[in-house]
């Protein structure tokens, strides 16, 4: 194939791949008709003048995972057809000015996972056709004004995993075609008003894992096409009332891991396309009426691991499409009987690790499609008559780790549980707490005659005496849970990352066998 170096493999499709620790310089001679060249996992430490001079037809050049620390300014001379250049995962600290001169066709430039300390406007001034610029995983502390001014066609810019402490409001002003901007895992403490005003076509903005404390009220007002906004793991303590007002296309918003103390009514919206809202790990103490009322299409709402002690009866107004509601690990003591009434499509509700001491009898009255209810680790002593009667699809009910009072009042619940044991799972059953003489005994098999009779004896016709048969051949056991949300974690999935670490967010939903507080 027009002379393939011994250290490389060359395919008929004009693709050359050179790998291995024994390679210490760009192999020669390279086939003149090569269109794709990959130099991976070698011990090359520098690129000298014009090592690719004779392969001017090259379209894609990947020089990744090497020891590369120095590049001569003329290293890429004569590569006028090059569209894709990756220098990712090397040891570059400095880019010579003019390095990309003459690369008039370049569309993708990957400089991620190096040790770059700074970039200058002159670095990219010749790259007017660039569509994608990856700079994540470097040591950049600031971006000078003008750095991207010539990249008017840029659609994707990744500056994540650097050491940026502030951003100039002018640095992105000419990037009107930008669709994806990633600034995650930096040290940003605030973002000046107007920073994103020029980004009228922006679809994704990733700001997670910074130290942002405050959002300017109009920060996103020009980003009408924004679909994904990642604000998780910052220090945001309050949301200005209008901050999300003009984001009609938004379908993903993550705010978990902040310091939010309250949510004002109407703060979210209108966002007709938002399907998931992740608010776990904040300091929210109450939910007022209509706080989510603009989120008509919301299907997943995660409010776990906050300090919620009060939910207004109309807090969930408007959430008619909601399927999953996670309220576990809060400070709830009481719930209004109407609080879930509007959630006609709710399938899974997670209320474990709260302080609930009783539930209203009508709490699930309008939520006929419930399939999973997590009530473990509360302070429930009994449940109202017929609370689960109408829940024909219920296949998972967790009631363990509550101080069940096994007097004669518990009989109706005990009888219903006896007939519906499969719903409880086999691993962890509810046990009596009082009276002391039956403490620790299974609520399902307890002989209530042994227990102390209650003050008033209820009329016995109570929980339905019809056995429950699952709709499907098998029902979930206690180790694997029916909740789909358990698998729908807010993983911010970036295809340009070398490795994507998907964290298991089961503890966020809290639907694991042993709860972790």
């Amino acid at each position: 194939y027009h002379g393939c170096p011994s250290e490389c493999t060359c395919s008929r499709a004009s693709q050359v791949e050179c790998t291995g620790a024994r390679i210490v310089a760009v192999p020669t001679p390279l086939p003149w008709n090569a269109m794709s060249l990959q130099i991976l996992n070698t011990h090359i430490t520098e690129l000298n003048e014009s090592p690719f001079l004779n392969i001017s037809a090259l379209i894609a050049l990947r020089i990744e995972k090497n020891e590369l620390s120095r590049i001569t300014p003329g290293a890429f001379r004569n590569l006028g057809s090059l569209r894709y250049l990756s220098l990712a995962n090397n040891k570059l600290q400095v880019l010579p000015i003019g390095l990309f001169q003459g690369l008039d066709s370049l569309e993708s430039l990957l400089l991620s996972s190096n040790q770059l300390l700074q970039i200058q406007p002159a670095h990219f001034s010749q790259c007017s056709n660039l569509k994608e610029l990856q700079l994540h995983g470097n040591h950049l502390e600031y971006i000078p004004d003008g750095a991207f001014d010539h990249l008017v066609g840029l659609t994707k810019l990744n500056l994540g995993k650097n050491s940026l402490t502030h951003i100039s409001p002018r640095v992105f002003q000419h990037l009107g075609n930008l669709q994806v901007l990633r600034l995650y895992e930096n040290r940003l403490t605030d973002i000046p008003m107007g920073t994103f005003d020029g980004l009228v076509n922006l679809q994704e903005l990733a700001l997670q894992q910074n130290q942002i404390g405050l959002l300017s009220p109009g920060l996103f007002h020009n980003n009408h096409n924004l679909q994904r906004l990642y604000l998780s793991n910052n220090h945001i303590s309050q949301l200005p009332p209008s901050v999300f007002m003009q984001l009609p296309q938004l379908n993903r918003l993550t705010l978990f891991g902040n310091s939010l103390k309250e949510l004002s009514p109407g703060i979210f919206g209108p966002m007709p396309n938002l399907r998931e809202l992740w608010l776990y790990d904040n300091h929210i103490s109450s939910l007022p009426d209509n706080v989510f009322s603009n989120l008509r299409q919301l299907q997943v709402l995660i409010l776990s691991r906050n300090q919620i002690s009060f939910i207004s009866p109309g807090a969930f107004n408007g959430l008619t499409e909601l399927r999953e509601l996670s309220l576990h690990t809060n400070a709830l003591q009481d719930l209004d009987g109407n609080v879930f009434r509007m959630l006609a499509n709710l399938q899974n509700i997670s209320l474990q690790n709260n302080r609930l001491r009783q539930l209203p009898g009508n709490i699930f009255a309008n939520v006929n499609g419930l399939m999973a209810i997590q009530l473990q680790n509360n302070q429930l002593e009994n449940l109202p008559l017929g609370i689960f009667d109408h829940l024909g699809k219920l296949c998972e009910l967790r009631l363990y780790d509550n101080p069940w009072r096994c007097d004669s009042d518990i009989l109706p619940l005990r009888n219903w549980l006896l007939l519906n044991q499969p719903r409880l799972g086999t691993d962890t059953v509810p046990v009596c707490f009082s009276p002391a003489n039956v403490r620790g005994q299974s609520l399902i098999i307890i002989n209530v005659n042994v227990a102390v009779p209650s003050v008033h004896v209820p009329e016995v016709p109570s929980y339905p005496e019809t056995p429950w048969y699952p709709d499907t051949p098998s029902y979930p056991d206690t180790t694997s849970v029916s909740s789909t949300t358990e698998l729908t974690s807010p993983v911010e999935d970036y295809t340009d990352l070398t490795t994507i670490q998907v964290t298991d967010d089961r503890s966020v939903w809290g639907m694991t066998q042993a709860q972790s507080g």
């Epitope: 363990y400 707490f433 620790g440």
Partner: antibody, heavy 120, light 112 residues
Framework: EVQLVESGGGLVQPGGSLRLSCAVS????????VHWVRQATGKGLEWLGV???????NYNSALMSRLTISKENAKSSVYLQMNSLRAGDTAMYYC??????????????WGQGTTVTVSS | DIVMTQSPDSLAVSLGERATINCKSS????????????HAWYQQKPGQSPKLLIY???TRESGVPDRFSGSGSGTDFTLTISSLQAEDVAVYYC????????FGGGTKVEIK
């Protein structure tokens, strides 16, 4: 006879971790919850957390990021794992349970405690 | 978190006299539906582990002498030892379990 016996205390370096055990007898961990409480010398009681019969846990919010409570029912043992120790964690560590009391968070049976000293 | 504040820090009472210890919580411990105050008192004698005396503000634990009584509701609670005995010398702690438990700082009771 109901008994709770703590062990695993001793001298720990700052920044290190500890794993305390609470061996129980006279009752089953599948039926009763076990709390951990600590007390610095000459100071008051501080509730650390609890593991309930079914395995659910609750933690003191100020210490939650450093604490893990677990148990092995078959071994009748409850464990307290604490990371990133500092001098302020020097204390007597107790485990306790609610054997007779009607108070769900009441602690009417206590171990004798195990002493943890954090020092270089 | 709910903060429990005890007063006084220490108290010296003659044998046979009444001892009164106060405890104030930063928020109400009364649950309106169960009508219970989630408040308890513990006694810790020198060199010993703590002992539960009273829960739900006024319910004496089994085996606790009737000279110990608890009272109060909402945010203000009192432990009274009607006739102090030598064996009552101890530190007394209040505790709330309305939210996750927190203890008061303790009151040391000595004989005058």
């Amino acid at each position: 006879e109901v008994q709770l016996v703590e062990s695993g205390g001793g001298l720990v370096q700052p920044g290190g971790s500890l794993r305390l055990s609470c061996a129980v007898s006279g009752f089953s961990l599948t039926s009763y919850g076990v709390h951990w409480v600590r007390q610095a010398t000459g100071k008051g009681l501080e509730w650390l957390g609890v593991i309930w019969a079914g395995g659910s846990t609750n933690y003191n919010s100020a210490l939650m990021s450093r604490l893990t409570i677990s148990k092995e029912n078959a071994k009748s043992s409850v464990y307290l794992q604490m990371n990133s120790l500092r001098a302020g964690d020097t204390a007597m560590y107790y485990c306790a349970t609610h054997m007779i009391t009607e108070d769900y968070y009441g602690m009417d049976y206590w171990g004798q405690g195990t002493t943890v000293t954090v020092s270089s | 978190d709910i903060v429990m504040t005890q007063s006084p820090d220490s108290l010296a009472v003659s044998l046979g006299e009444r001892a009164t210890i106060n405890c104030k919580s930063s928020q109400s411990l009364l649950n309106s539906r169960t009508r219970k105050n989630y408040h308890a008192w513990y006694q810790q004698k020198p060199g010993q582990s703590p002992k539960l005396l009273i829960y739900w503000a006024s319910t004496r634990e089994s085996g606790v002498p009737d000279r110990f009584s608890g009272s109060g509701s909402g945010t203000d609670f009192t432990l009274t030892i009607s006739s102090l005995q030598a064996e009552d010398v101890a530190v007394y702690y209040c505790k709330q379990s309305y939210n996750l438990p927190t203890f008061g700082g303790g009151t040391k009771v000595e004989i005058k």
